[in-house]
């Protein structure tokens, strides 16, 4: 089944996250080894009644630079994202289509490794390798060397001179003309092709389609996402740019969000969908202006890529134990206390019980339950749509999302839940009755 529809054309892109070591880590922990976004794939619209083809995917090599030594063992997360290109308010919408993860052992400098991962109805085929940037060599990129012809012992920028090998290892020589991007060799003189490429020198694409294919009786799985086309040696284009030769040099075709001779300059805008986990992108209509990601509750970072360690803020009162469940924060209260943050003494509400983290609130001699997000009813025992509680203040529009909810604020308001007016009109220096409320404002509003 295609992730796109005739009503909403879409295109796909990938996010790759690398972490060191073999430990099983949560998807939201930092991508300590590095992370990268691919270019957008071609626009695709499903044709009603037509069989589902292989989906058009982003082309080009996706490079994830790592600063320190290559750890040898690493974990990876590859997310396939769908960008819907309809006329929805606020621009394109992004949603996570599939996420695959794994743990691998890989030495730097080795050949391309192939992998197949499945996520639900989707199958992702990809190739990967770790490569040292000169003058680093070795399986961890920790040794420095000089070419056999180099007279000086210190490369430019190396101060003081690091311990250098006397000579670099002689490189493995593949068959003459073997494509440096689509072929590799493990024995001198051979030319073995990456997934999706063929021919004696691995220069012929098997198919122009690629490797994210729905599995099932009608699925065709020829072709795969592989390093991009172009005869440039070593692909000098960074950040997923594709390289083509020119009469004098080379030319990089940069993915959206990057520019410069080698696509090394980031100019990410909201159109590139830089905000993860349902973050709302604001500003950045052109590459020279910055964008800001307004993160939904529970996420932080310039791209909403990090989950907040909300327990570090010690939100639970009266000795309550904090539990960050990912989708929600829970406080396990000591006996005699209740509420989302254990802030209410149960005696205050005369033993009134509110389920699912709801809080008993006193008022005018009566008691009621203020329910946690996602629950409703008299005692908070009924499941509710996260937007049903109207969590967005001041007329903000609520959108349910896979990671929770997002508030789209009305003009003049901001904040994760639109709770802050940018310019409160008619504000005066002294409050009027009732105390603490701004004069002229309604006493309660959504």
């Amino acid at each position: 089944r295609s992730p796109c529809s005739a009503r909403l054309p879409c295109r796909l892109f990938f996010r790759v996250c690398l972490k060191p070591g073999l430990s099983e880590e949560a998807a939201e922990s930092p991508c300590a080894l590095g992370a990268a976004l691919s270019a957008r794939g071609p626009v695709y619209t499903e044709q009603p009644g037509a069989p589902a083809p292989d989906l058009p995917l982003p082309d080009g090599l996706l490079q994830v630079p790592f600063r320190d030594a290559w750890p040898g063992t690493f974990s990876f997360i590859i997310e396939t994202w769908r960008e819907e290109l309809g006329d929805q308010i606020g621009g394109p919408a992004w949603s996570l289509l599939a996420r695959v993860a794994g743990r691998r052992r890989l030495a730097a400098g080795g050949p391309w490794a192939r992998d197949i991962q499945r996520a639900g109805a989707w199958e992702l085929r990809f190739s990967y390798r770790a490569r040292c940037e000169p003058p680093a060599v070795g399986t961890a990129c920790t040794r420095l060397c000089r070419p056999r012809s180099a007279p000086s012992r210190c490369g430019p920028g190396l101060r003081p001179c690091a311990p250098l090998e006397d000579e670099c290892e002689a490189p493995l020589v593949c068959r003459a003309g073997c494509s440096p991007e689509h072929g590799f060799c493990e024995q001198p003189g051979e030319c073995r092709c990456l997934e999706g490429w063929t021919g004696p020198l691995c220069t012929v694409p098997v198919s122009t389609s690629s490797c994210l294919s729905p599995r099932g009786p009608s699925s065709a799985t020829t072709g795969c996402l592989v390093p991009g086309p172009g005869p440039c040696d070593g692909n000098p284009c960074a950040n997923g740019g594709s390289c083509s030769e020119t009469p004098r040099s080379f030319e990089c075709t940069c993915p959206r969000g990057f520019y410069g001779l080698r696509c090394e300059v980031s100019g990410v805008t909201c159109a590139d969908g830089p905000c993860f986990n349902g973050g709302l992108c604001v500003g950045g209509a052109d590459p020279d202006s910055a964008y800001i990601c307004h993160c939904p509750p529970g996420f932080q970072g310039s791209n909403c890529e990090k989950r907040v360690d909300r327990c570090s803020l010690q939100p639970c009162r009266n000795g309550g134990l904090c539990l960050d469940l990912g989708h929600a924060l829970r406080c396990r209260c000591r006996a005699g206390f209740a509420g989302p943050r254990c802030e209410h003494d149960l005696d205050d509400c005369a033993g009134r019980a509110c389920a699912n983290g709801g809080t008993c609130v006193e008022g005018g001699g009566a008691h009621r339950c203020s329910c946690a997000l996602g629950f409703g009813g008299r005692d908070c025992r009924e499941r509710a749509d996260p937007c049903a509680a109207r969590p967005c203040a001041h007329g903000g529009r609520c959108y349910a999302h896979f990671s929770g909810l997002v508030c789209a604020c009305a003009p003049g308001y901001m904040g994760a839940r639109c709770e802050f007016p940018v310019h409160p009109d008619g504000a005066s220096a002294l409050p009027a009755a009732p105390p603490g409320l701004r004069p002229g404002d309604p006493q309660r509003y959504l």
Epitope: G298, T359, V361, E362, S370, A416, G436
Partner: nanobody, 117 residues
């Protein structure tokens, strides 16, 4: 009912620093999103910085990189650390709270900040 009490205002030379503090007291103070606003003479009151119940923050463009808002849940306070102050930062600074239980808006009395050149 929630009461807000600001402190920390005063006179400072341009380039200097001040730390404003706002203490919230009363009922259900843990359900507050809090912010700092300011109002210069003859101008509208404007948002300076806000912090939501999930800890996410918002800043006015004019103070980004200079001001930092933070909260101490245990003490029910929200602080505004103001560095590299400029004469145009002179204003009365108000503490603001939005209580989610009943969606009431609360304001403090304000504290004067004067930056001299």
């Amino acid at each position: 009912q929630v009461q807000l009490q600001e402190s920390g205002g005063g006179l400072v030379v341009a380039g200097g620093s001040l730390r404003l503090s706002c203490a919230a007291s009363g009922s259900s103070v843990s359900f507050l999103s809090m912010a700092w606003y300011r109002q210069a003479p003859g101008k509208k009151r404007e948002l300076v910085a806000g912090i939501s119940t999930d800890g996410s923050t918002n800043y006015a463009d004019s103070v980004k990189g200079r001001f930092t808002i933070s909260e101490d849940n245990a003490k029910n306070t929200v602080d505004l650390q103001m560095n590299s102050l400029q004469p145009e930062d002179t204003a009365v600074y108000y503490c603001y709270a939005y209580r989610w239980i009943d969606r009431y808006t609360y304001w403090g009395q304000g504290t004067q900040v004067t930056v001299s050149s």
